[in-house]
Interface confidence: medium
């Protein structure tokens, strides 16, 4: 049984997709697409602010962890990368770039350094780090 | 500028995609799509033969590494996972499930155990392992 007709404008032909298969995206070219979210890992080391600016310039934001189920690919990510989580000293909370507060039990926060920014590490860990320290970073774009 | 009209049959409406964005796939539901290849990481530990059978049952194969550029997402994979690489004792070569020989300089083969199967480890390393040892595994499906 086939469904989901995809109009491929490049070749102007119909491609048939089995019910169990689907397209993912849309995402920026050569980004990773998973459960209709787009991710890209950047090798160059930048501080948190530069990393944020780099993601924004690509119409994305630094990684936001919102669901262990929908983002289970993050379990297997090696090393440490800036994500969009910052510490608000006034109330002691951790919040994402969009202003939302970090949900309980999503990340294990580990105080590696003194700082107000957080690195993502495998198995849903967040390592506190000084925001001016250069690190690799993960950009994310949520599809509509 | 917008292009690539996508016919969304679910809502029967047109979604416009910017030129710099694209859909990836098709892939099995909830698989990772990257540069039009589909990947899935399986948590349950199986031996190499069971892992191969699991991938085949999903119309896929165990991971084949064919390009550091097209598969650079594999750089950051944590831990060790079965891939579709086996040792042919008669001629000493390493070959993929499809019969093709491992290209030089794609993987650094490290003999950590006695065996004729290989685990994928981050940064394009292959760890030799006994084929009957249970490990997690990576399935891959190349899109047409």
């Amino acid at each position: 049984i086939w469904s989901a007709v995809f109009l491929n404008s490049l070749f102007n032909q119909e491609v048939q997709i089995p019910l169990t298969e689907s397209y993912c995206g849309p995402c920026p070219k050569n980004w990773i697409c998973y459960k209709n979210n787009c991710y890209q890992f950047f090798d160059e080391s930048k501080n948190w602010y530069e990393s944020q600016a780099s993601c924004m310039s690509q119409n994305a934001s630094l990684l936001k962890v919102y669901s262990k189920e929908d983002q289970d690919l993050l379990k297997l990510v090696k090393s440490y990368h800036w994500m969009g989580l910052v510490h608000i000293p006034t109330n002691g909370s951790w919040q994402w770039e969009d202003g939302s507060i970090l949900s309980p039990n999503l990340l294990t926060i580990i105080e590696m350094q003194k700082g107000d920014c957080a690195l993502y590490a495998s198995s849903f860990k967040g390592y506190i780090e000084n925001c001016s320290t250069p690190n690799t970073y993960i950009c994310m774009q949520r599809t509509v | 500028i917008w292009s690539a009209v996508f016919l969304n049959s679910l809502f029967n409406q047109e979604v416009q995609i910017p030129l710099t964005e694209s859909y990836c796939g098709p892939c099995p539901k909830n698989w990772i799509c990257y540069k039009n290849n589909c990947y899935q990481f399986f948590d349950e530990s199986k031996n190499w033969y069971e892992s191969q059978a699991s991938c085949m049952s999903q119309n896929a194969s165990l991971l084949k590494v064919y390009s550091k550029e097209d598969q650079d997402l594999l750089k950051l994979v944590k831990s060790y996972h079965w891939m579709g690489l086996v040792h042919i004792p008669t001629n000493g070569s390493w070959q993929w499930e499809d019969g093709s020989i491992l290209s030089p300089n794609l993987l650094t083969i490290i003999e950590m155990q006695k065996g004729d199967c290989a685990l994928y480890a981050s940064s394009f390393k292959g760890y030799i392992e006994n084929c009957s040892t249970p490990n997690t595994y990576i399935c891959m499906q190349r899109t047409v």
């Epitope: - | 490290i110 003999e111 006695k114 940064s123 760890y127 006994n130 040892t133």
Partner: antibody, heavy 123, light 107 residues
Framework: QVTLKESGPTLVKPTQTLTLTCTFS??????????VGWIRQPPGKALEWLAL???????RYSPSLESRLTITKDTSKNQVVLTMTNMDPVDTATYYC???????????????WGQGTMVTVSS | QSVLTQPPSVSVSPGQTASITCSGD??????VSWYQQKPGQSPVLVIY???KRPSGIPERFSGSNSGNTATLTISGTQTVDEADYYC??????????FGTGTKVTVL
């Protein structure tokens, strides 16, 4: 001739972070297959592997200590640095760095070890 | 976590053979290395890949590994062989694992 030498504080207070440096000579940590590992040994007890860094900057950690450890390398200075956070008196040990042979078939062996540095954790 | 179990101590007379065992689940499927550590000194690799000796290690040191047990054998044991000995293996879950250690006493 391959040599390695560990350096760092001999005394750290509980909850502090330990930083150890391994300075080596006789090999390059950019040669394919090569790695440098850290192993510790509490007084009168067995060896315990902590971490390893490969030539390609791939890092491996003991699963039980992974959240506390960071290993880095400076190829130009021929140095490998291990940091261990939240030190506790049970972390009192001699800390060794060791060269992981570049021979593929001897992949699990540490063929040359440093002299070790004793670290005491006490307030 | 993998566990490699060694006898705490082995006693041997000079010139006799000392055998040190290292036990672990399906250890014969893995490569085993052995290290010698004399008091106040760093460990020295004496056997790697079950049976191979690094250059400079005397021929009296040999290794074997099958089933669940690896064995380090010192033939014609000398007083200079008095030391602690550790086996070591690797697996994809625990990575580099050392044995519990065996003290060899040459009587």
């Amino acid at each position: 001739q391959v040599t390695l030498k560990e350096s760092g504080p001999t005394l750290v207070k509980p909850t502090q972070t330990l930083t150890l440096t391994c300075t080596f000579s006789g090999f390059s940590l950019s040669t394919s297959g090569v790695g440098v590992g850290w192993i510790r040994q509490p007084p009168g007890k067995a060896l315990e592997w902590l971490a390893l860094i490969y030539w390609d900057d791939d890092k491996r950690y003991s699963p039980s200590l992974e959240s506390r450890l960071t290993i880095t390398k400076d190829t130009s200075k021929n140095q490998v640095v291990l940091t261990m956070t939240n030190m506790d008196p049970v972390d009192t040990a001699t800390y060794y760095c060791a060269h992981r042979t570049g021979i593929a078939v001897a992949g699990i062996a540490f063929d040359i070890w440093g002299q070790g540095t004793m670290v005491t954790v006490s307030s | 976590q993998s566990v490699l179990t060694q006898p705490p101590s082995v006693s041997v007379s000079p010139g006799q053979t000392a055998s040190i065992t290292c036990s672990g689940d399906k250890l014969g499927d893995k490569y085993v290395s052995w290290y010698q550590q004399k008091p106040g000194q760093s460990p020295v690799l004496v056997i790697y890949q079950d049976t191979k000796r690094p250059s400079g290690i005397p021929e009296r040191f040999s290794g074997s590994n099958s089933g669940n047990t690896a064995t380090l054998t010192i033939s014609g044991t000398q007083t200079v062989d008095e030391a602690d000995y550790y086996c070591q293996a690797w697996d994809s879950s625990s990575l580099y694992v050392f044995g519990t250690g065996t003290k060899v006493t040459v009587l």
